[in-house]
């Protein structure tokens, strides 16, 4: 059983997930059929820039051009219309800028509504910018093949977009999926771009495709699931996660921690602090604060970011994984360096966990 | 503390227009669906149109009664949501509520509402 | 248009179970969302899909779903739980709420 001391902390808000895009309006870039276009990334310190149009891998071909922080597209044309994203990966982290690229005869006026405050919509359902369907979030998408235990729940997501808003419709293993072809149905949320099937069992095991379509034109992508039978066993964490990190003060860091459990998982993010300038209570036991934990509040758990940290950030952070078998925990360390000297790889240091079980 | 605030209710003339406010705090704004939720006076509940994420899409959707007149739009950097309201109804007397989704993704279910702005439509 | 149907109005003894339904064509192929409303007060979630309870929510509140039919159940109801209370759910991609229900907890 696990013993320590956890010191109260109330205010404590649960983490929402980091926002790695843009918050402000995406800029437009217009341009008449035919023209050329060029498009500086507006991100800083960009390492390794990558480019998606549509949220698609965007590469160099006969008339786009892609040039350090540059793009460029030659003779544009209606079809190069679109929600276009540079993606600038660094060290500790990535950030993303989106723009939207318009190619159009005529220049829009946007809406007839008196709108001072300058937010557009991305896209305007209601505007004549017909548009077949098209994935708005390919991120959601890459994981292809789930193995998912029985009893559990899963989501299969299709985020996409269009004009008019496209309807989604799901096949399994090429055929139409209804809801008697399995105990208890599935759940549809149109609005999500999601299916939900809650207690899979052997019988769910298949391809199940989303096929997105509207007057325009029709995507298709298609998921794998696997439905493993149940072995209890307490949480396995990946080895090497977390893993240590350091960052100037200021900065911001991520620690992950990706867990593998059959049962229901807990996950905690915990440190050692002080307290009456003490590491240790009247018990002999250190102090630790649960930083963030599992549950309705809290999305992604596997990830603790912290944000513009100062020098009492510094030290061990420790990832404690339960279920109702056992547990198992991994910690790394955050070293936080003055402003003025930047941080450079961190050398492996080996932490024993053991004094938390 | 998570919070929307409203603003911008009042008293219009039938054919008017009034551009409601809300304000949120507390949460990463930009992360989730938002919606206008109205409520006439004495009765039910009834949803006008909502606004996707960034990361969705940023596009909305509307209510039959509503689409055409009223637009939804969102200002990421200043935290705040609008309902232009345009070809005002007496029928569009209610209080308006803005509400966000319970998570970024997962969930379509209100979990935090704002106080309500009173929209008096009136000769 | 899709309906989501609730009674006009249920009465229940104080600590005893209170049902209020909600129907709506297949409407167990939905998540079903239920929400508190007192007077002059905005309303608050006390069920999402179908049968989760927001934290803050206490456990005397569930829900269930299935075929055409969702229920809130509030079980030893007390006088601070009469209320008017919605269901909610989705066709296609626009929100649809109950005509609700008030809940008078007598005694």
């Known amino acids: 059983r696990p013993s320590f001391s956890l010191v109260e902390d109330t205010t404590l808000e649960p983490e929402e997930p980091p926002t790695k895009y843009q918050i402000s309006q995406p800029e437009v870039y217009v341009a008449a059929p035919g023209e050329s276009l060029e498009v500086r990334c507006l991100l800083k310190d960009a390492a390794v820039i990558s480019w998606t149009k549509d949220g698609v891998h965007l590469g160099p071909n006969n008339r786009t051009v892609l040039i350090g922080e540059y793009l460029q597209i030659k003779g544009a044309t209606p079809r190069d219309s679109g929600l276009y994203a540079c993606t600038a990966s660094r060290t500790v982290d990535s950030e993303t800028w989106y723009f939207m690229v318009n190619v159009t005869d005529a220049i829009s006026s946007g809406d007839d509504e008196d709108d001072t405050d300058g937010a557009e919509d991305f896209v305007s359902e209601n505007s004549n910018n017909k548009r077949a369907p098209y994935w708005t979030n390919t991120e959601k998408m890459e994981k292809r093949l789930h193995a998912v235990p029985a009893a559990n729940t899963v989501k299969f997501r299709c985020p996409a977009g269009g004009n008019p808003m496209p309807t989604m419709r799901w096949l399994k293993n090429g055929k139409e999926f209804k809801q008697e072809h399995r105990i208890g149905g599935y759940k549809v949320r149109n609005q999500h771009w999601s299916l939900i099937m809650e207690s899979v069992v052997p019988s769910d095991k298949g391809n199940y495709t989303c096929v997105v379509e509207n007057e325009y034109g029709s995507i298709n992508h298609t998921y794998h699931l696997d439905v493993v039978e149940r072995s209890p066993h307490r949480p396995i964490l990946q080895a090497g996660l977390p893993a240590n990190a350091s960052t100037v003060v200021g900065g911001d860091v991520e620690f992950v921690c990706k867990v593998y459990s059959d049962a229901q998982p807990h996950i905690q993010w915990i440190k050692h602090v002080e307290k009456n300038g003490s590491k240790y209570g009247p018990d002999g036991l250190p102090y630790l604060k649960v930083l963030k934990h599992s549950g309705i509040n809290s999305s992604n758990a596997e990830v603790l970011a912290l944000f513009n940290v100062t020098e009492a950030d510094a030290g061990e952070y420790i990832c404690k994984v339960s279920n109702y078998i056992g547990q198992a925990n991994q910690s790394a360390w955050l070293t936080v360096l003055p402003k003025q000297q930047a941080p450079g790889r961190e050398k492996e240091i080996t932490a024993s966990p053991d004094y938390l079980e | 503390e998570v919070q929307l605030v409203e603003s911008g209710g009042g008293l219009v003339k039938p054919g008017g227009s009034l551009r409601l406010s809300c304000a949120a705090s507390?949460?990463?704004?930009?992360?989730?669906?938002l919606s206008w939720v109205r409520q006439a006076p004495g009765k039910g509940l009834e949803w006008v149109g909502r606004i996707r994420s960034r990361i969705e899409g940023g596009t909305t959707d509307y209510a039959a009664p509503v689409r055409g007149r009223f637009t939804i739009s969102r200002d990421d950097s200043k935290n705040t949501l609008y309902l232009q309201m345009n070809s005002l109804k007496t029928e569009d007397t209610a209080v308006y509520y803005c509400?966000?989704?319970?998570?970024?993704?997962?969930?379509?279910?209100?979990?935090?509402w704002g106080q309500g702005t009173l929209v008096t439509v009136s000769s | 248009s899709y309906e989501l149907t609730q009674p006009l109005s249920v009465s229940v003894a104080l600590g005893q179970t209170a049902r209020i339904t909600c129907s709506g064509d297949?409407?167990?192929?939905?998540?079903v969302d239920w929400y508190q409303q007192k007077p002059g007060q905005a309303p608050v979630l006390v069920i999402y899909d179908d049968n989760d309870r927001p934290s803050g929510i206490p456990e005397r509140f569930s829900g269930s779903n299935s075929g055409n039919t969702a229920t809130l159940t509030i079980s030893r109801a007390q006088a601070g739980d009469e209320a008017d209370y919605y269901c909610?759910?989705?066709?296609?991609?626009?929100?649809?709420f109950g005509g609700g229900t008030k809940l008078t907890v007598l005694g």
């Open positions: 509400a966000r989704d319970r998570s970024p993704s997962d969930s379509s279910a209100f979990a935090i």
């Open positions: 507390g949460f990463t704004f930009s992360s989730y669906a």
């Open positions: 909610q759910s989705w066709d296609s991609l626009s929100v649809v």
């Open positions: 297949n409407l167990g192929s939905q998540y």
